[in-house]
């Protein structure tokens, strides 16, 4: 179906619930080069077309996955089970350099945060990604929200360039990411 | 395919101590916890404590602190559990265990029997 | 430490029944339970995670619920292979604990 962009409070969504990225104030359908221009070209992985495309329509391709910037509030778990029936999983970021393109794409949206794969059961154990691989701090550090009121933020947003813990029950948008062999 | 390969079966005398290795294949063996879990003959199963491979940190149960040991040999993907001052009632299967979602245990080794009999 | 508590601590069913496995935790735990299935010499295998997921490559007629203290892991239809132990374990605090097990055997 064709994707409709409108404006909302300055940021860029698509009617059916999904966020692409800003394309230097165009708000007309995005096309592939527009796709391209959001990311660093060299990473950018180059299709002729939609049907030769590794991804989904609608997911921005960078690198070896597709990614989804889903623009329906959710709490962290449901968040998750919205991923998982489009097939794949919350964000988890791997790199620099895909933390710099996640960066790029959500800084669009300075007014909205978005539910990344990373959670714990409690403070006193470590953030652990959905798919139960190790997180390390080498990579990104996680600006605590704790507060007496608020003892016990086991979850994990990403608000422009600051990755943060939240209460899993608030509701948020969320990064979707389906990994593909290239 | 994910893999953990187990040590063989050990025969202690008490006061010994055994090391049980767990040798990982089919994926990154440091992007994942390995735990420890042991089971006594007819018995139900005990979390030990678990090792991350990437940095080496451990956490074990404190019921086993002060004399288990669980490291890991990155270049050839191994964990390994030792047990000291070993007692009769140690006489278990040892399992490896790799980490999956919400802290669970998706991937088993087939289990060291380990015997502590004088 | 959390004590978990299975019950019953064994049931007799037929191929075919619809069997239900309760676990308790000693104190909330959140959606952080998994459930594993363990026949006899042989290692345990999981079934669900985080209270509720289905582990890849397990039969759908396994299912799990609950959150906080209470859980339950459902056979919808017991089929000849079921016939096993089944454990649940807590994630939510150290050291994780397992339940004592719920035998299921044939009747």
């Known amino acids: 179906t064709m994707a409709i962009w409108r404006s909302n409070s300055g940021s860029n969504t698509l009617e059916n619930g999904y966020f692409l990225s800003r394309n230097k104030e165009n708000h007309s359908q995005p096309t592939q080069s527009s796709l391209e221009d959001s990311v660093t070209p060299t990473k950018a992985v180059k299709t002729t077309g939609v049907l030769s495309s590794p991804c989904p329509p609608n997911w921005i391709i960078y690198e070896k996955s597709c990614y989804l910037f889903s623009m329906s509030l959710n709490s962290w778990d449901g968040s998750k089970r919205q991923c998982w029936q489009l097939g794949s999983n919350l964000l988890k970021i791997d790199s620099s350099n895909e933390l710099g393109f996640i960066v790029k794409q959500v800084s669009s949206q300075p007014d909205n945060s978005f539910w990344i794969g990373l959670s714990r059961p409690q403070t006193e154990v470590p953030w652990l990604w959905e798919d139960g691989s190790t997180f390390s701090s080498n990579l990104f550090q996680i600006r605590t929200t704790a507060t007496q009121e608020n003892p016990s933020p086991n979850c994990v947003w990403i608000h422009v360039s600051v990755i943060y813990d939240q209460l899993c029950s608030v509701p948020s948008y969320s990064i979707c990411e389906k990994k593909f062999s290239m | 395919q994910v893999q953990l390969v187990q040590s063989g079966a050990e025969v202690k005398k008490p006061g010994a101590s055994v090391k049980v290795s767990c040798k990982a294949s089919g994926y990154t063996f440091t992007d994942y916890y390995m735990h420890w879990v042991r089971q006594a003959p007819g018995q139900g199963l005990e979390w030990m404590g678990w090792?991350?491979?990437?940095?080496?940190?451990?956490n074990y149960a404190q019921k086993f602190e002060g004399r288990i040991t669980m490291t890991r040999d990155t270049s050839i993907s191994t964990a390994y559990m030792e047990l000291s001052r070993l007692r009769s009632d140690d006489t278990a299967v040892y399992y490896c265990a790799r980490n999956t979602g919400a802290y669970s245990f998706g991937y088993w080794g087939c289990g060291t029997l380990v015997t502590v009999s004088s | 430490d959390i004590q978990m508590t299975q019950s019953p601590s064994s049931v007799s069913a037929s191929v075919g029944d619809r069997v239900t496995i309760t676990c308790r935790a000693s104190q909330g735990i959140s959606s952080w339970l998994a459930w594993y299935q363990q026949k006899p010499g042989k290692c345990p295998k999981l079934l669900i995670y985080?209270?509720?997921d289905l582990q890849s490559g397990v039969p759908s007629r396994f299912s799990g619920s609950g959150s906080g203290t209470d859980f339950t892991l459902t056979i919808s239809s017991l089929q000849p292979e079921d016939f096993a132990t089944y454990y649940c374990q807590q994630a939510y605090g150290f050291p994780f604990t397992f339940g004592p097990g719920t035998k299921v055997d044939i009747k």
């Open positions: 090792i991350n491979p990437n940095e080496g940190d451990t």
């Open positions: 985080g209270a509720s």
